[in-house]
Interface confidence: low
């Protein structure tokens, strides 16, 4: 359905709050260095065209697509050559260029402070003196730093920060209200952009095919009552978002995915009996719901695989006629039945049944050829159950923090070309798949752990491909989105690698230390020992554990010691001296 | 995205006449075999017919074989099964599938043989 006004409908269809809200964080993800008012400027001036098109469609102007509408704007900001340097030739472009070179320059890992919590006292006072700049603010400053942040889950973030304040800052102890339930945002939102990171790289590095394909499996695997032409509706629907989302076009996708939210509560009968608590909400919370749904109970009489993908000799004819949705029904088929596996493992298996039948329907005699096909699945299936085990037993043996720590020695002897930061970074939240999954049921783990891993993996493929250091690292993102999580499983000791040269700067601690927090404490730990490993890439894991009981000692002492500067400079060079010696 | 509608479903008496269509959107209909199965009360899915995308091959389940009929219009984009001497045992959900997969795709249509 076609609009005189684009700007007008989404207007319309979205309601000024909405709108407002949209506008300033794909202003905020574009342009991530510009001030907070700048962007409340331009926003504001963007409502007030909008309004005018709203009042008369035919006013000049209106009929622009909101590419030409927001480009325009963006490119009026007068620093933009200071601030960004090259970006600034994307407005030398016309539409759809201009739009793709901004994408292009959208930064995952922007040069901004990180952003320091204010006493409560001091952010109730703000929330209550103005308590629309205070919500746009925190738009804005997660915005810029999350630029593929899911825009519409954006806002539900929003009106749940809006929420806490509301309560606890009328509360008796305000810092006991408010602080857990900040933290909570903190580590949903972290964790909310990653997840969608990843579905902008399947969708931008693989292909609306890659990405609907793992829709079809999730989706399968939540609404196993759903026919496959509904999983298939959904999945195009939900594909188109995600485009427009990823795409820059936040006010389409918030628009279209409340579309999807109310066919789904329209039909949820014959999508799935888990959906009725979510359909009673407001909007934003209401597809929050519906994309956190659970897995619906699996029919009881589901019928064996094989006869329609393995015994009927029509497999072939089948498969030739109409290979993606031949292809989309097995994968609907196979996920419906197991939720039990990760997401990215049905994938895998979906990829080995193509691969054999593109071999077998070439044979002399195809049934016999692809006979054993699910044989074949037995050792993909094995090796993320055996990945897990094998992990989940180290990280109760362990604890999060030494089980990060063997994460961070296995990643820094894989890949050592990346940076430490990176490498911290990183295996730090993979060791955080210890505390979310292993305590699980079994039939829970392999999709909790694995399908995480995709994810915090991502991370290290977007960061990557900014600064390129690591053939092995471009081979594992690029290659195969599937089998991104084996590939780097499989990585041995880089042998190649070149040792760093030893600084004793890198060693040197100050009495600073002892004020960080706990989480920062370790960070400056585990900042140490990828160093460590760099340095010393074949050192044992006993070598290495001494050097880091010896650090935590000397860490302790000195900070209990009166005069915690002096500790330091001089039990410091002797932490290194020995660590050296335990080295060498 | 890809939707099967089924219709020409009710209650008749046994000898009779039935003619169903199927209406496809959503894929091309032109490239891809099509078959007809049915779900009895209780059952599980049964397969009854399948036709080739061109329409040339049609294959038949033995317990319809000279009773059912199987065919397509390409331009129309619709499958059909005229199905005559229909018996109390024919009685199920008719629904059409895309390739031969007894997979439900769509809603189906209800027939009923009784006197």
């Known amino acids: 359905d076609t609009h005189k006004s684009e700007v007008a409908h989404r207007f319309k269809d979205l309601g000024e709050e909405h709108f407002k809200g949209l506008v300033l964080v794909a202003f905020s993800q574009y342009l991530q260095q510009c001030p907070f008012e700048e962007h409340v400027k331009l926003v504001n001036e963007v409502t007030e065209f909008a309004k005018t098109c709203v009042a008369d469609e035919s006013a000049e102007n209106c009929d622009k697509s909101l590419h030409t509408l927001f480009g325009d704007k963006l490119c009026t900001v007068a620093t933009l050559r200071e601030t960004y340097g090259e970006m600034a030739d994307c407005c030398a472009k016309q539409e759809p260029e201009r739009n793709e070179c901004f994408l292009q320059h959208k930064d995952d890992n922007p040069n901004l402070p990180p952003l320091v919590r204010p006493e409560v006292d001091v952010m109730c006072t703000a929330f209550h003196d103005n308590e629309a700049t205070f919500l746009k603010k925190y738009l804005y400053e997660v915005a810029r730093r999350h630029p593929y942040f899911y825009a519409p889950e954006l806002l539900f973030f929003a009106a749940r920060y809006k929420a806490a304040f509301a309560e606890c800052c009328q509360a008796a102890d305000k810092a006991a209200c408010l602080l857990p339930k900040l933290d909570e945002l903190r580590d949903e939102g972290k964790a909310s952009s990653a997840k969608q990171r990843l579905k902008c790289a399947s969708l931008q590095k693989f292909g609306d095919r890659a990405f609907k394909a793992w829709a079809v499996a999730r989706l399968s695997q939540k609404f196993p009552k759903a026919e496959f032409a509904e999983v298939s509706k959904l999945v195009t629907d939900l594909t188109k978002v995600h485009t427009e989302c990823c795409h820059g076009d936040l006010l389409e996708c918030a628009d279209d995915r409340a579309d999807l939210a109310k066919y789904m509560c329209e039909n949820q009968d014959s999508i799935s009996s888990k959906l009725k608590e979510c359909c009673d909400k407001p909007l934003l919370e209401k597809s929050h719901c519906l994309a956190e749904v659970e897995n619906d109970e699996m029919p009881a009489d589901l019928p064996s695989l094989a006869a329609d993908y393995v015994e009927s000799k029509d497999v072939c004819k089948n498969y030739a006629e109409a290979k993606d949705v031949f292809l989309g029904m097995f994968l609907y088929e196979y996920a419906r039945r197991h939720p039990d596996y990760s997401v990215m493992l049905l994938l895998r298996l979906a990829k080995a049944y193509e691969a054999t039948l593109e071999k077998c329907c070439a044979a002399a005699d195809p049934h016999e050829c692809y006979a054993k096909v699910f044989d074949e699945f037995q050792p993909l299936v094995e090796e993320p159950q055996n990945l897990v085990k094998q992990n989940c037993e180290l990280f109760e043996q362990l604890g999060e923090y030494k089980f990060q720590n063997a994460l961070l020695v296995r990643y820094t002897k894989k890949v050592p070309q990346v940076s430490t930061p990176t490498l911290v970074e990183v295996s730090r939240n993979l060791g955080k798949v210890g505390a979310k999954c292993c305590k699980l049921p079994e039939a829970k783990r392999m999709p909790c752990a694995e399908d995480y891993l995709s994810v915090v993996l991502n991370r290290l493929c977007v960061l990557h491909e900014k600064t390129p250091v690591s053939e092995k690292v471009t081979k594992c993102c690029t290659e195969s989105l599937v089998n991104r999580r084996p590939c780097f499983s499989a990585l041995e000791l880089d042998e190649a690698y070149v040792p760093k040269a030893f600084n004793a700067e890198t060693f040197t601690f100050h009495a600073d230390m002892c004020t960080l927090s706990e989480k920062e404490k370790q960070v400056k730990k585990q900042t140490a020992l990828v160093e460590l490993v760099k340095h010393k890439p074949k050192a044992t894991k006993e070598q290495l554990k001494g050097v880091m009981d010896n650090f935590a000692a000397f860490v302790e002492k000195c900070c209990k010691a009166d005069d915690k500067e002096a500790c330091f400079a001089e039990e410091g060079p002797k932490f290194v001296a020995a660590s050296q010696a335990a080295l060498a | 995205e890809v939707q099967l509608v089924e219709s020409g479903g009710g209650l008749v008496q046994p000898g009779g006449s039935l003619r169903l269509s199927c209406a496809a959107s959503?894929?091309?209909?032109?490239?891809?075999?099509m078959s007809w199965v049915r779900q009895a009360p209780g059952k599980g899915p049964e397969w009854v017919s399948a036709i080739d995308s061109g329409g040339a091959d049609t294959r038949y389940a033995e317990s319809v074989k000279g009773r059912f009929t199987i065919s397509r219009d390409n331009a129309k984009k619709t499958l059909y099964l005229q199905m005559n001497s229909l018996k109390p045992e024919d009685t199920a959900v008719y629904y059409c599938?895309?390739?031969?997969?007894?997979?439900?795709g769509s809603q189906g249509t209800q027939v009923t043989v009784s006197s």
């Open positions: 599938t895309i390739g031969r997969s007894t997979s439900r």
């Open positions: 959503g894929f091309t209909f032109g490239s891809f075999g």
